[in-house]
Interface confidence: low
């Protein structure tokens, strides 16, 4: 598995990561850490593992965290009750 760097699918990344769109170059996907407490997230992000190609630049939140709305268009990873 690729621990970091370019990828195409989640299976090419290490544990605790997903293959997300680069925030710098949209045509490139890179192995990205899953969301930690307080990280920005997107509520429609696919869960790991996803066997297709992601369209988001964020990964889902780590296990035990949920992607929750904090304002009209902002979501962050918060502890699941």
């Amino acid at each position: 598995a690729v621990i970091t760097g370019a990828c195409d699918k989640d299976s090419q990344c290490g544990g605790g990561m997903c293959c997300a769109v680069s925030i710098w170059v949209k045509s490139i996907r890179i192995c990205t850490p899953m969301g930690k407490l307080g990280d920005s997230c997107h509520p429609l992000t696919r869960k790991v593992p996803f066997f297709g190609r992601r369209m988001h630049h964020t990964c889902p939140c780590l296990p035990g965290l949920a992607c929750l709305r904090t304002s009209f268009n902002r979501f962050i990873c918060l502890a699941q009750k």
Epitope: P43, G52, S71, Q80
Partner: antibody, heavy 121, light 111 residues
């Protein structure tokens, strides 16, 4: 057993405000969002908005922006809908409905019994 | 806003026969390969009841004679063998973007 119990029927004059309550029980209140939906007599369903019971963040149907306020009181596990500047077209049954937490599908799995709000001069 | 249009407005079906309700969205309600469409049943004097979420997922406790299908803009709720207790109004709802919007409803009756 999950239950959503709403306040009783209201009769209001045009221009007034109404506040409907929805007391939740049988689940962890802050783990679920709460939606409000209304239904005019003999008509279909209209989504008003929803609130995160966890942090109070709201999303409203733009149609009601400026007239609607959704709040929660975590200490009593109660959600509130306040609608101001009432007009006759606001006469409807107002429902609270819990979001089922089905991933990104905002599906309303438990509903209150409804509160009839009548706006009449 | 996404406009949801159901057809037919009403439907009379014999007991044990299949009932099919269609719902068309004014734009796609798909996202990342999933379809953000729910179906509800409402009986007179009662609040709506969730039947299907995310186009094809049966809500817990709902009989398996109910099923949902479709993607993009076209969706279907099917009752494979209509029972007397299925007489109700059925609503589709898109939840792909807010405001979440409902169809106008389809009334299902016994023929």
């Amino acid at each position: 057993e999950v239950q959503l119990v709403q306040s009783g029927a209201e009769v209001k004059k045009p221009g007034a405000s109404v506040k409907v309550s929805c007391k939740a029980s049988g689940y962890s209140f802050t783990d679920y969002d709460m939606h409000w939906v209304r239904q005019a007599p003999g008509q279909g369903l209209e989504w008003i908005g929803y609130i995160s019971a966890y942090n109070g963040a709201t999303t409203y149907n733009q149609k009601f922006k400026g007239r609607v306020t959704i709040t929660v009181d975590k200490s009593t596990s109660t959600a509130y809908l306040e609608l101001s500047s009432l007009r006759s077209e606001d006469t409807a049954v107002y429902y609270c409905a819990r979001d089922g937490n089905y991933g990104e599908a905002y599906a309303m799995d438990y509903w209150g019994q409804g509160t009839l709000v009548t706006v009449s001069s | 806003d996404i406009v949801m249009t159901q057809s037919p407005d009403s439907l009379a079906v014999s007991l044990g026969e299949r009932a099919t309700i269609n719902c068309k969205a004014s734009q796609s309600v798909d996202y990342d390969g999933d379809s953000y469409m729910n179906w509800y049943q409402q009986k007179p004097g009662q609040p709506p009841k969730l039947l299907i979420y995310a186009a094809s997922n049966l809500e817990s406790g709902v009989p398996d004679r109910f099923s949902g299908s479709g993607s993009g803009t076209d969706f279907t709720l099917t009752i494979s063998s209509l029972q007397a207790e299925d007489v109700a109004v059925y609503y589709c709802q898109q939840i792909n973007e807010d405001p979440f919007t409902f169809g106008q409803g389809t009334k299902v009756e016994i023929k």
